[in-house]
């Protein structure tokens, strides 16, 4: 079956703050109550589970991975945060109602090759871009 | 002061479904109960509010914008979803406990020029990359 995971949906505690532009690197373990920081997680996707078995010949599925976790102040150094994400983290820290925290999303994606039937039932080998998460970050 | 916004944190209703890889374009009005879809929102960031007035000379602030909204099945055609985001949306749709929905994040960012004091109190004009959201999408 398609994937499994444990997810924490907790909101960050956000004591008021006002501050600056690249705190992405401020914490190696940022969340005060040990919520997981933004990172890559395991996910195997079965094409049968998606209902694609009639047109995808191979592979049967693939390791897609996914991104999830906190992008809270102060951000971890490995979070590859953009300048905008750092600013947004600080704005959220000042006033959580103003903006959401940045979100944990793929920063690098890889392709996979898929053998499939096209509309005319020809067998096609095609490389589909941006199918596999290689790295995650705060955006 | 730095920005203001209204945010809906509602979870999507996710009836079971099975579907395919370019379903990103399936709906022009995706959310069944009119939750806002992923899009760019207004946000003005004041450098004083961030506590940066001691080193940033100009500007006093800037229009940063931010991304927020639903990345629920079926995705709107303008959401610039990656293939992985489409797959993740479907996996979430089949079993919401497996993975989160993709998140709404910047797809294009612009730079701004900043006049500031360096370590030696010299006045420097520098272009800071990835400071302004130009477009949002589902990732």
């Amino acid at each position: 079956s398609t994937g499994s995971k444990q997810r924490s949906q907790n909101r960050s505690k956000t004591p008021k703050n006002q501050e600056a532009l690249r705190m992405a690197n401020v914490a190696e373990n940022s969340s005060s109550d040990q919520r997981q920081a933004c990172k890559k997680h395991e996910l195997y996707v079965s094409f049968r589970d998606l209902g694609w078995q009639d047109w995808i010949i191979a592979p049967e599925g693939y390791a897609a991975y996914y991104c999830e976790g906190e992008c809270a102040f102060p951000l971890n150094s490995y979070m590859n945060a953009t300048n905008h994400a750092i600013v947004q983290t600080l704005v959220h820290f000042i006033n959580p109602e103003t903006v959401p925290k940045p979100c944990c999303a793929p920063t690098q994606l890889n392709a996979i090759s898929v053998l499939y039937f096209d509309d005319s039932s020809n067998v096609i080998l095609k490389k589909y871009r941006n199918m596999v998460v290689r790295a995650c970050g705060c955006h | 002061s730095t920005g203001s916004k209204q945010r809906s944190q509602n979870r999507s209703k996710t009836p079971k479904n099975q579907e395919a890889l370019r379903m990103a374009n399936v709906a022009e009005n995706s959310s069944s109960d009119q939750r806002q879809a992923c899009k760019k929102h207004e946000l003005y960031v004041s450098f004083r509010d961030l506590g940066w007035q001691d080193w940033i000379i100009a500007p006093e602030g800037y229009a940063a914008y931010y991304c927020e909204g639903e990345c629920a099945f079926p995705l709107n055609s303008y959401m610039n979803a990656t293939n992985h985001a489409i797959v993740q949306t479907l996996v979430h749709f089949i079993n919401p406990e497996t993975v989160p929905k993709p998140c709404c994040a910047p797809t294009q960012l612009n730079a701004i020029s900043v006049l500031y004091f360096d370590d030696s109190s010299n006045v420097i004009l520098k272009k800071y990359r990835n400071m302004v959201v130009r477009a949002c999408g589902c990732h």
Epitope: P15, N17, E19, R22, M23, V26, P74 | W52, D119
Partner: nanobody
């Protein structure tokens, strides 16, 4: 090259207090946050407390109510007041200063040992 120099570590009995200091060797432009981290044997480095240049603070749950972070803007110094110390607070404590647009600055660490 900017250096951060920590001091104030040492050995103390459980329930005791220490005050750590972290001084920058020269002015750093664009500082927006400073933090104290700690690392004990076999564990990852973890955030203890952080402070912004506008003096807003954030604490790890395990030190809330016991530790206080503060800073002296004029002297580029950040402090960590540690009260009611526990044996599990034993670690090497590191100072970090984050400046916009460049790599973070780390101190070399100061050891804190709390005996029961």
């Amino acid at each position: 090259e900017v250096q951060l120099v920590e001091s104030g570590g040492g050995s103390v009995q459980a329930g005791g207090s220490l005050r750590l200091s972290c001084a920058a060797s020269r002015r750093i432009s664009g500082i927006y946050a400073m933090g104290w981290y700690r690392q004990s044997p076999g564990k990852e480095r973890e955030l203890v407390a952080a402070i912004t240049t506008s003096d807003h603070t954030n604490y790890a749950d395990f030190v809330k109510g016991r530790f206080t972070i503060s800073r002296d803007k004029v002297n580029n110094t950040v402090y960590l007041e540690m009260n009611t110390l526990k044996p599990e607070d034993t670690a090497v404590y590191y100072c970090k200063q984050s400046a916009w647009g460049r790599n973070d600055y780390w101190g070399q660490g100061t050891r804190v040992t709390v005996s029961s």
